[in-house]
């Protein structure tokens, strides 16, 4: 029994991979912000975590995923406000009882020291510090990426 | 209603550097792009650059070399600093909000002149 | 750099009368996040600039509705359906897919 966010979240992830292929992104657009090999972009307004997930959909991202610690640090680290919480793309699945990222992945334990309890219509929100379980109803700013294409040499046979 | 107020020097040297500092009221610098914009006396106007509320800028390329934008969050200020000025950078200076390119807020401006 | 033309330079118009501004674009001016933006700003003699329209036709709040906006890709529109006295001013179309650029401005004044 999959849960409305869960739904949600499979919805959209599933609607992205219907839209046809765009070429790669080379650089970030403007007012989006370069981190490594992403592109993120940080809301200005507050909702709940489904809207925020939508939100992204429309700008063609995602909510922000966060591979390991040192990605989390990497992106607190342009945070300049304590105060300000932002969903990323990571909520609590009831039916398989664990943290999943909206790509379908399940939270490693030791890439996150999440602050607060595990369960249901819970979802993730990061701040300059912290990494805090919220109910995913709560009103706060979220976070949204894109890849950016690594550039490959290009190798031309001989002619 | 958010308002903005531009403030600094209305005369600057040649070579010098221009300072101009933008206070906002009615809302916080904690959200949004801030952004300067320039019109030159009778002509059009045009973008410097913005600072974004997580502190991160972006400047237009044709003056990046002279331009540095900044923010005090604790005054709700954002600054423009350019740099080796020319006659050729005397307009009126606007502060605006940006809302990814909705520039919805803006100062009444304040003329810089560049002159010996 | 993103080009903006617009045209005419100079609309003279008759009190109540309709008047049409038009921008065009060197390049499309559609974001890698899907939005257009495209917005029009109005400034009056001795007065900052004003927001009258973003993403193409998104009117900001307090602006009449005798001003609308239309367009896509490279072509853009700004129509006043009745010229009003306080309409009067410099319009300037602004793209902002790239690093924002305006356009030379339209001077809208009354015959």
């Known amino acids: 029994q999959k849960s409305s966010i869960e739904k949600c979240s499979v919805d959209i992830q599933q609607s992205r991979n219907k839209t046809t292929e765009r070429p790669g992104l080379l650089n970030c657009p403007i007012y989006w912000q370069q981190l490594r090999e992403k592109c993120l972009l940080f809301s200005h307004t507050v909702n709940p975590w489904n809207n925020s997930l939508a939100d992204c959909s429309t700008k063609e991202s995602s909510l922000l995923l966060i591979r390991d610690k040192d990605e989390l640090i990497h992106t607190q680290n342009l945070i300049r406000d304590k105060a300000i919480l932002f969903w990323i793309g990571l909520n609590f699945s009831l039916s398989e009882k664990n943290w999943k990222w909206i790509n379908g992945s399940f939270l490693n334990s030791n890439d996150l020291e999440i602050r607060g309890d595990a369960k249901e219509n819970s979802c993730i929100s990061i701040s300059q510090t912290s990494v805090y379980s919220e109910y995913c109803s709560t009103e706060i700013r979220w976070i949204c990426q894109k890849e950016l294409t690594p550039v490959r040499n290009k190798v031309y046979p001989d002619s | 209603q958010v308002q903005l107020q531009e403030s600094g020097p209305g005369l600057v040297k040649p070579s010098e550097t221009l300072s101009l500092t933008c206070t906002v009221s009615g809302g916080s610098i904690n959200s949004y792009y801030w952004s300067w914009i320039r019109q030159p006396p009778g002509k059009g106007l045009e973008w410097i650059g913005y600072?974004?509320?997580?502190?991160?800028?972006n400047y237009n390329p044709s003056l990046k070399s002279r331009v540095t934008i900044s923010m005090d969050t604790s005054k709700n200020q954002f600054s423009l600093k350019l740099s080796s000025v020319t006659a050729a950078d005397t307009a009126v200076y606007y502060c605006?909000?940006?809302?990814?390119?909705?520039?919805?807020?803006w100062g009444q401006g304040t003329l810089v002149t560049v002159s010996s | 750099d993103i080009v903006m033309t617009q045209t005419p330079l100079s609309s003279p118009v008759t009190l109540g009368q309709p008047a049409s501004i038009s921008c065009r674009s060197s390049q499309s001016l559609v974001h890698s996040d899907g939005n257009t933006y495209l917005t029009w700003l109005q400034q009056r003699p001795g007065q900052p600039p004003r927001l009258l329209i973003y993403e193409i036709s998104n009117r900001f709040s307090g602006v009449p509705d005798r001003f609308s906006g239309s367009g896509a890709g490279t072509d853009f529109t700004l129509k006043i359906s009745r010229v009003e006295v306080e309409d009067v001013g410099v319009y300037y179309c602004m793209q902002a897919a790239q690093f924002p650029t305006f356009g030379q401005g339209t001077k809208l004044e009354i015959k």
């Open positions: 605006a909000r940006d809302r990814m390119g909705a520039l919805d807020y």
């Open positions: 600072i974004y509320y997580i502190g991160s800028t």
